[in-house]
């Protein structure tokens, strides 16, 4: 039976959700007037870059769009971007597609996503609404790197 990605709404501790704005992901308050993305998550079958201490290796995509999250260096800084790619195309590749890979680790009831390409860099939201989802190596008060994955049908 072919694997299928799991679907989640994603939310942080300040009740900010991820929203698609053009071809970018931004954080916005959970409200009736905005449509949060549904995140597609599927495990990578290739174990080349695996590190159990850091979590399970996963690909992250946007449900209903051929868009996946990936990491690239821009002006010397690891940056989170969306790339036109079907998550299942990544899944069926025999070799792990490193820029698209994240370590998914559970911390209590929250999830943390660390870039496989750039160890120590985590997906984060700012404390300010309307800002892009980004990568940070500063985990703490000013950046939120812990997310709730809410099951959606």
């Amino acid at each position: 039976r072919e694997a299928a990605p799991k679907s989640y709404a994603i939310r942080d501790s300040r009740q900010m959700v991820w929203v698609l704005s053009g071809n970018s992901l931004i954080a916005a308050p959970l409200s009736r007037s905005i449509k949060p993305v549904t995140l597609h998550l599927i495990a990578c079958r290739d174990t080349e870059f695996s590190d159990k201490e850091k979590g399970n290796m996963v690909y992250l995509g946007i449900k209903g769009k051929d868009l996946c999250l990936f990491c690239a260096e821009i002006q010397g800084k690891p940056t989170l971007q969306l790339k036109e790619k079907n998550i299942m195309d990544l899944y069926v590749e025999k070799k792990a597609q490193k820029p698209f890979l994240f370590f998914h680790n559970k911390e209590g009831s929250t999830s943390v996503f660390q870039s496989v390409s750039y160890p120590g860099w985590f997906i984060a939201t700012s404390t300010t609404s309307g800002q892009p989802i980004f990568l940070t190596k500063e985990r703490g008060i000013t950046n939120n790197t812990n997310f709730y994955l809410d099951s959606v049908e």
Partner: antibody, heavy 122, light 112 residues
Framework: ELQLQESGPGLVKPSETLSLTCTVS??????????WGWIRQPPGKGLEWIGS???????YYNPSLKSRVTISVDTSKNQFSLKLSSVTAADTAVYYC??????????????WGQGTLVTVSS | ESVLTQPPSVSGAPGQRVTISCTGS?????????VHWYQQLPGTAPKLLIY???NRPSGVPDRFSGSKSGTSASLAITGLQAEDEADYYC???????????FGGGTKLTVLG
């Protein structure tokens, strides 16, 4: 139909711990995307949010009460509870439990218990 | 003092239209979190009247409507009836407090 019912002592002595339970019927306390809250109303005054717990077990507390509040869930009894320590007369109020769903009521509370009056007095 | 500010009281004659304001800040209403309104009849628990700024739960008459702009929101009641006499509360979420916040409440008196 989802219903909530508060229970607990109506009289608590100063400096003691107030303990209340909210029993959920007509639905599961572990239902996805659900949050459960405690709100109080001192006599003749307005509503004050005390704290919440959600289906993941995450707790959120009013900063002004945080040092004294604990909210927990008992899934086997389909209940959630409030503990408020070191109470004073200022904690005398009607205590309500309430609930909502993240992606349906958008951080509002659509079902409330009837409320229970707790008096702090020696 | 409440995080959200409401007038303590408003009044109107039967059949009239009244509005109740709710003023917040850039960390709650102004941050685009939704505003919800509750009606509390004397001696009863609050009841959700408006959710998500302008949506009525089933069973709430269309005489009640909500709106939001900037850091403020308002509840409008048209065709005022004696049974509308109650306390009304607005509520939102505040990211700086990581919690839910209420207005101080507004007592609506139906005259006559």
């Amino acid at each position: 139909e989802l219903q909530l019912q508060e229970s607990g002592p109506g009289l608590v002595k100063p400096s003691e711990t107030l303990s209340l339970t909210c029993t959920v019927s007509g639905g599961s306390i572990t239902a996805s995307n659900t949050y459960w809250g405690w709100i109080r109303q001192p006599p003749g005054k307005g509503l004050e949010w005390i704290g919440s717990i959600d289906y993941t077990g995450s707790t959120y507390y009013n900063p002004s009460l945080k040092s004294r509040v604990t909210i927990s869930v008992d899934t086997s009894k389909n209940q959630f509870s409030l503990k408020l320590s070191s109470v004073t007369a200022a904690d005398t109020a009607v205590y309500y439990c309430a609930t909502g769903k993240y992606y349906e009521t958008y951080l509002g509370f659509d079902v409330w218990g009837q409320g229970t009056l707790v008096t702090v007095s020696s | 003092e409440s995080v959200l500010t409401q007038p303590p009281s408003v009044s109107g004659a039967p059949g009239q239209r009244v509005t109740i304001s709710c003023t917040g800040s850039s960390s709650n209403i102004g941050a685009h979190y939704d505003v919800h309104w509750y009606q509390q009849l004397p001696g009863t628990a609050p009841k959700l009247l408006i959710y998500g700024n302008d949506n009525r739960p089933s069973g709430v008459p269309d005489r009640f409507s909500g709106s939001k702009s900037g850091t403020s929101a308002s509840l409008a009641i048209t065709g005022l009836q004696a049974e509308d006499e109650a306390d009304y509360y607005c509520q939102s979420y505040d990211y700086s407090l990581s919690g839910y916040v209420f207005g101080g409440g507004t007592k609506l008196t139906v005259l006559g």
